[in-house]
Interface confidence: low
Amino acid sequence: IVLRPSRVHNSEENTMRALTLKDILNGTFSYKTFFPNWISGQEYLHQSADNNIVLYNIETGQSYTILSNRTMKSVNASNYGLSPDRQFVYLESDYSKLWRYSYTATYYIYDLSNGEFVRGNELPRPIQYLCWSPVGSKLAYVYQNNIYLKQRPGDPPFQITFNGRENKIFNGIPDWVYEEEMLATKYALWWSPNGKFLAYAEFNDTDIPVIAYSYYGDEQYPRTINIPYPKAGAKNPVVRIFIIDTTYPAYVGPQEVPVPAMIASSDYYFSWLTWVTDERVCLQWLKRVQNVSVLSICDFREDWQTWDCPKTQEHIEESRTGWAGGFFVSTPVFSYDAISYYKIFSDKDGYKHIHYIKDTVENAIQITSGKWEAINIFRVTQDSLFYSSNEFEEYPGRRNIYRISIGSYPPSKKCVTCHLRKERCQYYTASFSDYAKYYALVCYGPGIPISTLHDGRTDQEIKILEENKELENALKNIQLPKEEIKKLEVDEITLWYKMILPPQFDRSKKYPLLIQVYGGPCSQSVRSVFAVNWISYLASKEGMVIALVDGRGTAFQGDKLLYAVYRKLGVYEVEDQITAVRKFIEMGFIDEKRIAIWGWSYGGYVSSLALASGTGLFKCGIAVAPVSSWEYYASVYTERFMGLPTKDDNLEHYKNSTVMARAEYFRNVDYLLIHGTADDNVHFQNSAQIAKALVNAQVDFQAMWYSDQNHGLSGLSTNHLYTHMTHFLKQCFSLSD
């Protein structure tokens, strides 16, 4: 149980106030984290509060400004990147968001040795992606879907690709579906460790169907946005991987990396690329039916200037109970012999654990084990492996950092974070310097977040990087809700839940209940993290109890729970929310006539289905940007969990799992449907179809659209959205305004 600091004395109580909606919308109680921008084993960069770029040397304790705020301001720079030889900095301005990760920008190169901007051979604008080589100051960038290379910032560019074309051929950057559902990056190019080679992906979207929607803007006629977007079962992008020698790029040109035969025999995806050495690269491929993944290690053949991927260096990962991997197939972390690697995948008991692969996957040595999951491998050095897991005290919603000494036999395991600030910090991530000489720990809660710097050898805390003192002081006179994390055992299923309780919670009283749900495959909502957000306000000021439940399909509790939803999305996720609500009612403090559910995206889908479950449990609910039919969503995501919408595969469940099919069941609930018209991700089409089905069934409902807003409903729309949802819930729960 995590109890937020409570105030005991009545005199103190009087000076304290509840959270307001304005607090939330203004971000009054937002926290800061500190992630060092490591540039060596003992040095990092950080942008100071006054916008100077400062280099810190941990060992000397010295810091100095490498780039002044004056220089930053001269080009309205919002971001920077130092070249590895420390001679140049790129300054990024005119940021223009595209999709989740992608954006375009204008780039200026500042010459630190001369103290001026590089002039001549300047970069074109806007650039889709730009990065330094890992050594020296070479630049690779993508402009108009083609890749260019500069040996030095002031040199003329060398054009690597020539076939790039908007919405057709993408070089070095992903198309929409690869960005959102496979790579989770804005880039699709990778420098080799010493900058000798540059690998890149080419995506051919020529045959992909296009989603088109109106962008209303301010003009007389709306613009039409066209995005090649493969929905479930549609034609997918065709991907090819090339590698070019950046020292002599014109010599042999880009060389294609062969696709493993067992992958190439049918539709497939490229999932990630990992450089091992300058002349060894590891590619991961995935069948379109995403239960077979192949990791292929390829070597540079100097004599032919080609890349060879021997079958003996192909490692197959297959799932017989679900899809391959968790949300994504994990990526390997190679050891210093440059052939063996560490990787997270399911063990024989169905828990994701770290394995060491030396020759074949079959002969993998399991490094971690237990009824918990290893979540991320941060760093492998010659003597240590750092990873995160949720092992400690058997709370799946925690994250602690562990070190395994791989240099000694038998390897010994140490929890680096478990006992550091036990009450305050139970959910960590980490950022390591080169050779793990130093690392930063970022604690996200459940207490106020804190970032600290540590010695990579001794794990000793060196200093606090950010402790959010201002936030701590600001919260001193705020009545925060209490939070508890517990579990329900139902029919051999463990349902972890987080309950957010009003500050003066009294078990003998009855409270309205709001379920906040996401519930997507491999997600986790019940986490030991700090947050002062909309639901905090609803508990603090409006006296609601809010609950989040991780049901079947959610992550980090083993494959049985995770893969339970395989090929049948929209069934167990909903059942488990309903089961939890019934258990909450049994606890005795829930007013069963005032229960609501809300969710966004996948959560909007689950909340809609829960409202239409016919249980009579829910008085009202909200769906923000919901999926309404899996036929409308992206192929890569949807087919991972649902297979194909074909008669001989899983069309029947595609049809059965729509929100529209349950339109009739919305008759006895109050339903608020919300969507942005420019949602590139979950298309407005989804809500349009729900609305149409409800109208056709003559079911009353409420709706709100946000013109020209995407899946995030940002800016002023956010304020409007939460104000609108608050009114809706207060009305539903008969709470006075």
Epitope: P84, D85, D383
Partner: antibody
Framework: DVQLVESGGGVVRPGESLRLSCAAS????????MSWVRQTPGEGLEWVSF????????HYTDSVKGRFTISRDNSKNTLYLQMNSLRAEDTAVYYC?????????????WGLGTLVTVSS | EIVLTQSPATLNLSPGDRATLTCRAS??????LAWYQQTSGQAPRLLIY???SRATGIPDRFSGSGSGTEFTLTISSLEPEDFAVYVC??????????FGGGTKVEIK
């Protein structure tokens, strides 16, 4: 003041072994990578071996791979070069050198050198 | 490996003269090039790193320039103590770290 003092040189026969040491002072030894560089009489400089600050990473020039081993003891502020199966062409003055900054393997401080003579 | 070729092998000059020494790399080394001075029987002394950055305590008559494969060390006005061997070293692509063969600056 930074000081690097090599020792352990001498005259040996081909096939024999020798262990060079380099005692460091005047700087935080454990924070810097170190290298051995040799110079054949009347010839140029040749890099021999590199070791990272913590000793986890070592590199060698091809001609000494498998024969020489670089190591360090940070508690003693000392760098070592174990030379086995010595050959006549290994005859040189051996310098230990301190890297100026991590990632940049050039040397701001050098020892005075120790002479290794391999002769039958 | 990257081969560094220095020219000329010997440079005969008088005190006060300007000395221009060249170091050519067999392939690009970016700006990862250092220059050392070595007087007979002594250890090398770092003059320039990153092609053009003067090391601590080095007089400003020494300057380095160049990038990629062509580098120059310039001594604007030779002092008596400057007559020595000058060696370039690349640290761009290593191992191995490689040195040039050296240029000997002799008194004419």
């Amino acid at each position: 003041d930074v000081q690097l003092v090599e020792s352990g040189g001498g005259v040996v026969r081909p096939g024999e072994s020798l262990r060079l040491s380099c005692a460091a002072s005047g700087f935080t030894f454990s924070s810097y990578a170190m290298s051995w560089v040799r110079q054949t009489p009347g010839e140029g400089l040749e890099w021999v071996s590199f070791i990272s600050s913590g000793g986890a990473y070592t590199h060698y020039t091809d001609s000494v791979k498998g024969r020489f081993t670089i190591s360090r003891d940070n508690s003693k502020n000392t760098l070592y070069l174990q030379m086995n199966s010595l050959r006549a062409e290994d005859t040189a003055v051996y310098y230990c050198a301190k890297e100026k900054e991590i990632w940049n393997a050039f040397f701001d401080y050098w020892g005075l050198g120790t002479l290794v003579t391999v002769s039958s | 490996e990257i081969v560094l070729t220095q020219s000329p092998a010997t440079l005969n000059l008088s005190p006060g003269d300007r000395a221009t020494l060249t170091c050519r790399a067999s392939q690009t080394v970016g700006s990862k090039l250092a220059w050392y001075q070595q007087t007979s029987g002594q250890a090398p002394r770092l003059l320039i790193y990153d092609a053009s950055s003067r090391a601590t305590g080095i007089p400003d008559r020494f300057s380095g320039s160049g990038s990629g494969t062509e580098f120059t060390l310039t001594i604007s006005s030779l002092e008596p103590e400057d007559f020595a061997v000058y060696v370039c070293q690349q640290y761009y692509d290593w191992p191995p770290l490689t040195f040039g063969g050296g240029t000997k600056v002799e008194i004419k």
